[in-house]
């Protein structure tokens, strides 16, 4: 109620001669600060005296002295809140009731605390879950209701006496609800620790002994059990006994059930101790073990592998990898069930013996296509030899061998003709499916294994042919060698270098740029009349007559090839010059008479001079001189003289006879 | 007469799809291998794809800069080639041709304007 | 383009042109090369296939040559009417797929 003080410390407080003990204390006073504090040793209220009489082993007054034989008892408290207490050493006949009297201005209070101190250190208590299995971690606990800040002691744990390797964890409380030593120790038991005394070992500081507490482990487990065969090595033939017996070691608690186990698969009818096996056979080969229960769980032995002898059964070869690529590795297995594993194997391909291959690999570091077929092995061991299997199939894959590019035409192959050719090939895994050809078309086309080429042109060279399955192989190109007629057939001057003049060496050559076969002919023709056979055409002296059309021709055995038709040009100087008169030689006076300066030149006349019978020069340099009218003076001899860029050219005289008219007759 | 007539040209935005259609007749189209060929305005050719006959595993190739976004397909029955243009972007406007390798002839073409 | 031509060419009636094409060892170099005639507003017209073989219809006037990693297309007697884009075109095995010339415009003047 609300006139009481309120105090918070442990109801009781335990420790041994000679250590120490910490009394942890908090309390409120009603009113004010404390004034006067006493500790005393079982006290008793004195009815007379109003006061409490007992050994007061501490105590404090308003003027704070202390006895100086109090200091193996020391407050640690304070006015208002703190009240604790250490005494140090403690002894054993300070056991019992301490009372720690309060007082302030206007109140008084009596506060009772036990103390429990013993002869001699007294043991901590393990504390155990209710139930150990094996592996199943626990906490075991270890709790020593007793802690001091000037006594150090420590908890140590032991299995069988010897210090357990697990850490364990301790903890200390010196606190107003609980003052303990704690240690706890986290462990997973297996069953071979049943029945095993652990310790929790009390030491001082040094690890002096101080007490202990002991408790025995009842580790719940499995059946542990042991397997013993006979014979003891587990191998045995066909046909022959063999038996094993089941022993428990250990089971806590007690066993229930006994059952066998092969290859982990219960064998029915089979639950006593000893399992026996009569006249085994290659199939009851395998892992055997007994399993024995208790309410934990199965228990099981440990295996026993049961080898039973027997001769390699008809093999069979596993192929890595088939189909192979020519040129990879390949490796071949033989697998034959047998017991003990065979020791020589015999290797055949295609029913053929395959010499010093013992293995039960063989491996084919760079396969060819020569190495497909079947592949079968036999397996021996020390029982005996096995039987051939069906073998298996190696199937290599290779490129199309052997391409060739085939002309099917009969030979020469003229400029024009159809030429077929065909793709052919020697061997091929998997099949062809395909063909390509070069050179190629601008847009790749499906081809057969024959390519049609219509109108071969001249220049048609090689083509190459790829027969393809999953590869291609390409054979070496073929040269068509097309033949054809001389091709670009031209007249050209050799010389001279310069326009020909008359007179001039003149040569001209009839070239080709190409022909197949390379044998030709030459012909030259002017205006359809044969000149020579060679490839040139030679006028020491050219004269106008030799100007003219000129066309070449080159042939071979294909064919014939004009040129175009070439203009060979003379140039010369005016020549047959000559005066005509019109109307004629004779002309009456009066009338008109025109002379014509008549010539041959090329280039043509670019400038005409006249010339009377005294070789005098005419005033007229046209081709015509005209004369009108005609005088009588104008009788006589008259020539002209022609300019080109070439040279000049004169005429012979021309006489022009001009008569009297008859007018002029009759007027004499 | 070989002769190979396209259609399904027309305006699309970019990002956009369409489809070409190309009819041959006068020669065995299913042994063909079809060809697409297109013009950008004012610009060169350019081979865009082909789809190889069934008889040759029908696949079809591509030039780098249509690949992953045309698709090449035919119906032999229908003597038809498709071009199916996705992602369509504003370089891919121009005339498109189809063309047979097997006798080199051309179709008319028909245009595809790829604009915002 | 993977194959070079140049872009323009010109010449008069009866004249003499010749369009250039210049590849590769992987195209032109081992593959045939194919001419083509574009007139304005029409599909491309095959003009010379396998190096220098004419179509039918194809007049002589037009001829193909090839040399190395080279092809060329002549025309003679040059006509108004081949006023026309050409393109030549190869396989080009390293793409497996056929390539053009980026086209040359012929300029009858």
């Known amino acids: 109620d609300s006139s009481k003080w309120v105090f918070e410390h442990p109801e009781t407080l335990y420790a041994w001669e000679g250590a120490c003990v910490w009394i942890p204390c908090t309390y409120r006073a009603l009113d004010g600060d404390l004034e006067s504090f006493i500790l005393f040793h079982n006290p008793e209220y004195n009815k007379n005296t109003s006061k409490f009489d007992g050994t007061r082993l501490y105590e404090s007054t308003k003027d704070g002295k202390v006895p100086s034989e109090q200091k193996r008892v020391q407050f640690l408290g304070d006015k208002n809140k703190n009240c604790t207490l250490s005494i140090h050493p403690v002894h054993l006949n300070d056991s019992g009731q301490l009372g720690l009297r309060m007082e302030s201005k206007t109140e008084k209070w009596m506060e009772r605390i036990h103390l429990n101190v013993s002869e001699r250190p007294f043991p901590p208590h393990i504390q155990l879950p209710p139930e150990i299995q094996e592996s199943q971690e626990v906490t075991l606990t270890c709790l020593l209701n007793f802690s001091c800040y000037g006594y150090p002691i420590q908890l140590q744990w032991l299995l069988e006496g010897v210090p357990m390797r697990q850490a364990a964890v301790t903890s200390t409380s010196l606190t107003i609800k609980s003052v303990f030593t704690r240690s706890e120790l986290k462990f997973s038991p297996q069953w071979s620790h049943h029945g095993k005394i652990v310790t929790c070992q009390l030491q001082d500081a040094d690890g002096k002994f101080l007490s202990n507490d002991t408790v025995q482990l009842n580790v719940k487990h499995t059946p542990k059990l042991e397997i013993k065969v006979t014979p003891s090595d587990a191998i045995v033939r066909e046909g022959d006994s063999v038996t094993m017996t089941c022993e428990v070691s250990s089971s806590n608690p007690e066993y229930t059930t006994v059952s066998w186990l092969k290859d982990g698969t219960s064998l029915k009818k089979q639950n006593t101790f000893t399992l026996n096996l009569r006249e085994v056979t290659k199939d009851q080969s395998g892992k055997y073990c007994c399993q024995v229960s208790n309410d934990v769980g199965p228990g099981r032995s440990e295996e026993v592998f049961l080898q039973v002898q027997y001769a390699p059964e008809p093999s069979t070869v596993q192929i890595l990898h088939s189909p192979a690529v020519e040129g990879s590795q390949v490796e071949f297995l033989c697998m034959s069930l047998a017991n003990p594993l065979p020791t020589n194997y015999t290797w055949y391909h295609n029913g053929k013996e395959m010499q010093g291959r013992t293995e039960e690999k063989v491996h084919i570091p760079k396969i060819l296509p020569w190495h497909a077929g079947t592949y079968s092995c036999v397996a021996e061991n020390i029982l005996g030899t096995g039987q051939r299997g069906p073998g298996a199939e190696l199937d290599v894959q290779y490129p199309p061998k052997k391409v060739t590019t085939v002309i099917q035409n009969p030979m020469p192959i003229r400029e024009g003709d159809t030429v077929t050719l065909s793709c052919n090939y020697n061997s091929s895994n998997p099949s062809v499916t395909r063909y390509e050809w070069k050179p190629h078309g601008a847009w790749e086309e499906p081809s057969l294994g024959v390519l049609k080429i219509q109108n071969v042109g001249w220049d048609n060279t090689t083509i190459a042919c790829a027969a393809c399955n999953s590869w291609c192989s390409w054979a070496s190109p073929v040269a068509l060698n097309v033949q054809y007629a001389p091709r670009d057939v031209r007249v050209r001057k050799i010389k001279p270098l310069s326009e020909i003049h008359s007179g001039n060496s003149v040569s001209l050559q009839c070239d080709f740029s190409s022909s197949h076969p390379k044998e030709v002919q030459f012909f030259w023709e002017k205006n359809g009349r044969l000149l020579g056979k060679e490839s040139q055409l030679n006028f020491d002296s050219i004269s106008p007559e030799d100007a003219g059309s000129y066309s070449c021709w080159v042939n071979n055995s294909i064919g014939q090839t004009a040129s175009k038709a070439w203009t060979l040009e003379v140039l010369y100087a005016p020549r047959r010059l000559r005066v005509s008169m019109s109307p004629g030689d004779q002309v009456m006076e009066g009338k008109s008479a025109t002379l014509t300066c008549e010539s041959d030149a090329n280039p043509p006349v670019s400038h005409y001079t006249w010339f009377d019978w005294n070789n005098q020069s005419l005033p007229y340099h046209s081709q015509k001189l005209r004369l009108e009218p005609v005088k009588v003076q104008h009788s006589g001899a008259y020539w002209c003289q022609g300019t080109n860029s070439v040279g000049k050219g004169r005429s012979p005289l021309s006489t022009l006879t001009v008569y009297y008219s008859p007018e002029t007759i009759g007027r004499r | 007469e070989v002769q190979l007539v396209e259609s399904g040209g027309g305006l699309v935005k970019p990002g956009g799809s369409l489809r070409l259609s190309c009819v041959a007749s006068g020669f065995t189209f299913s042994n063909a291998w079809m060809n697409w060929v297109r013009q950008a305005p004012g610009k060169g050719l350019e081979w865009v794809g082909r789809i190889k006959s069934k008889t040759d595993g029908g696949t079809a190739d591509y030039a780098a800069p249509v690949k992953g976004r045309f698709t090449i397909s035919r119906d032999d029955s229908k003597n038809t080639m498709y071009l199916q243009m996705n992602s369509l972007k504003t370089e891919d406007t121009g005339v498109y041709y189809c063309i047979t390798g097997a006798t080199d002839v051309w179709g008319q073409g028909t245009t595809v304007t790829v604009s915002s | 383009y993977v194959l070079t031509q140049p872009p323009s060419a010109s010449g008069t009636p009866g004249q003499r042109v010749t369009i250039s094409c210049s590849g590769s060892?992987?195209?032109?170099?081992?593959?045939?090369v194919y001419w083509y005639q574009q007139l304005p507003g029409t599909a491309p017209k095959l003009l010379i296939y396998r190096n220098n073989q004419r179509p039918s219809g194809v007049p002589d006037r037009f001829s193909g040559s090839k040399s190395g990693t080279s092809a060329s297309l002549a025309i003679s007697g040059l006509r108004s009417e081949d006023e026309a884009d050409y393109y030549c075109a190869a396989w080009d095995d390293s793409l497996s797929g056929p390539v053009f010339g980026g086209g040359t415009k012929l300029t009858v003047l």
């Open positions: 060892s992987s195209n032109i170099g081992s593959n045939y």
